[in-house]
């Protein structure tokens, strides 16, 4: 009795992160004996859609030609072999930009900043948020999620670094995102170069893990006036 | 890319109400605030209120408060601007601009509006 | 109500030369909870809807071009065109988002020389 088959790989070109309005082809990739594909996506009904191997029958194509908030999600596709259907395989998710106005990024107080010293990047958005994102430029991964804790909504969120080393240093953005479905974010914020001067080094700098609130003070302009709660944001580092 | 495009030019007898539409496209409508920005002939830009298409949330500028009223349909990608109680002073080009962060970054193309007996 | 006033009403300037536009408001439009000053600079010309130049007061808006720059803080902006161009006859208005309702300057008219 031969084992379960093999589960497919999943991917998407050319990336998993995509604008609205622009194109993106997900390939699943099985075996050569594989008859059928089929695409499902979480939350939606099975299967999502299916598709005929490509020659030689180890992949399948599925094209969405403009991106929109439908197809933002996690996906999964499985291969139908002449002995059945295979493993899932690992989640893929298709994360949309553009679905809310771009945030604005800040470094308090300032964005030059000398080695051994504070630095909080702040972002704010237009609408409030229950979810912000910090990326630095080059980095593999989001270098940090906050989101808040009841699903309250926040204009803003802070990122302090401290103490800022070397490392620190960079092209920082960040997005926004609200709770209902973490697949969509906002535009990216316009670029925030954070410089570090100074002789103080650390190669491995441990990031702050104080708790932000989005609470802005008196004079924090167009900020609604009850529409923020006081409440805090949970970090998740990544 | 964004485009917002608004109806055509009315004309209107004082005392009645006008209702201008803009349709978006381009974008992502439902995560974009939606404003209403008026001008005169011949004048300078005063605004109106906004809406924000997810929700149905607005706020209206004081001086405009209980003659407009901003309404959004999600299935056209469309928002409404109507105004009543029209006198001879609404006589303007009104804009319809999507908000960025408070500033706008694209605007439709205006629609004239003429009060007039 | 933020009051914005602009100056000087209009402007004319000679093709290649330096143009600026003055814009002041009745309050601080700068934030101290991000150090940035909300302030906006749009371009209109004849028959056209007006179009964003400069956010954040001296922010270029993305395809505008580099001779175009914003500047200032607090109460006192300048919009500066570094080289004037014929294409840059339009009316210029500043406008803060610092507070609602949103305000707009009266306009500067800048014509060639």
């Known amino acids: 009795q031969a084992g379960p088959l093999p589960k497919p790989t999943l991917w998407a070109e050319p990336g998993s992160v995509i604008s609205w309005g622009n194109s993106v082809t997900i390939w699943c990739q099985g075996t050569l004996e594989a008859r059928e594909y089929r695409l499902d996506k979480e939350e939606s009904p099975a299967p999502w859609d299916r598709q005929n191997p490509l020659e030689p029958k180890n992949k399948a194509r599925f094209s969405i030609p403009s991106m929109t908030e439908d197809y933002a999600g996690r996906y999964r596709c499985y291969y139908r072999s002449p002995v059945g259907w295979s493993q899932p395989s690992d989640p893929l998710e298709l994360v949309m930009t553009g679905a809310y106005s771009k945030p604005t990024l800040s470094a308090l107080p300032s964005p030059l900043v000398t080695s051994g010293k504070s630095v909080t990047l702040l972002c704010q958005s237009r609408s409030p948020m229950d979810t912000f994102l910090l990326i630095k430029e080059r980095a593999a991964h989001p270098l940090l999620h906050l989101r808040s804790e009841h699903g309250a909504q926040q204009h803003q969120a802070e990122f302090p670094m401290s103490p800022v080393t070397s490392v620190h240093g960079g092209t920082y953005r960040c997005f926004s995102s609200h709770g209902f479905s973490h697949y969509l974010l906002s535009h990216p914020s316009d670029p925030l170069e954070l410089i570090v001067s100074g002789s103080l080094e650390d190669p491995r700098p441990s990031p702050t893990r104080s708790v932000s609130t989005a609470a802005g003070p008196e004079d924090q302009p167009l900020m609604p006036t009850g529409s923020v709660p006081h409440s805090g944001l949970r970090r998740h580092w990544e | 890319q964004v485009q917002l495009v608004q109806s055509g030019a009315e004309v209107k007898k004082p005392g009645a109400s006008v209702k201008v539409s803009c349709k978006a496209s381009?974008?992502?409508?439902?995560?974009?605030?939606i404003d209403w920005v008026k001008q005169p002939p011949g004048k300078g830009l005063e605004w109106i209120g906004y809406?924000?298409?997810?929700?149905?949330?607005?706020s209206y500028n004081q001086k405009f408060k209980g003659r407009v009223t901003m309404t959004v349909d999600k299935s056209t990608s469309t928002v409404y601007m109507e105004l009543s109680s029209l006198r001879s002073e609404d006589t303007a080009v009104y804009y319809c601009?999507?908000?960025?962060?408070?500033?706008?970054?694209?605007w439709g193309q205006g629609t004239t509006v003429t009060v007039s007996s | 109500d933020i009051v914005m006033t602009q100056s000087p009403d209009s402007l004319a300037v000679s093709l290649g030369e330096r143009a600026t536009i003055n814009c002041k408001s009745s309050?601080?439009?700068?934030?101290?909870?991000?150090?940035?000053?909300?302030l906006a600079w749009y371009q209109q010309k004849p028959g056209q809807a007006p179009r964003l130049l400069i956010y954040?007061?001296?922010t270029r808006e993305s395809g505008v071009p580099d001779r175009f720059a914003g500047s200032g803080s607090g109460t006192d902006f300048t919009l500066t065109i570094s080289s004037l161009q014929a294409e840059d006859v339009a009316v210029y208005y500043c406008?803060?988002?610092?507070?609602?309702?949103?305000?707009f300057g009266q306009g500067t008219k800048l014509e060639i020389k």
């Open positions: 601009a999507r908000q960025a962060f408070y500033y706008f970054d694209s």
């Open positions: 954040w007061a001296s």
């Open positions: 381009g974008y992502s409508f439902t995560g974009f605030y």
């Open positions: 309050q601080s439009l700068l934030s101290s909870s991000n150090q940035k000053n909300y």
């Open positions: 406008q803060q988002y610092y507070s609602y309702p949103l305000t």
């Open positions: 809406i924000f298409p997810s929700n149905g949330e607005t």
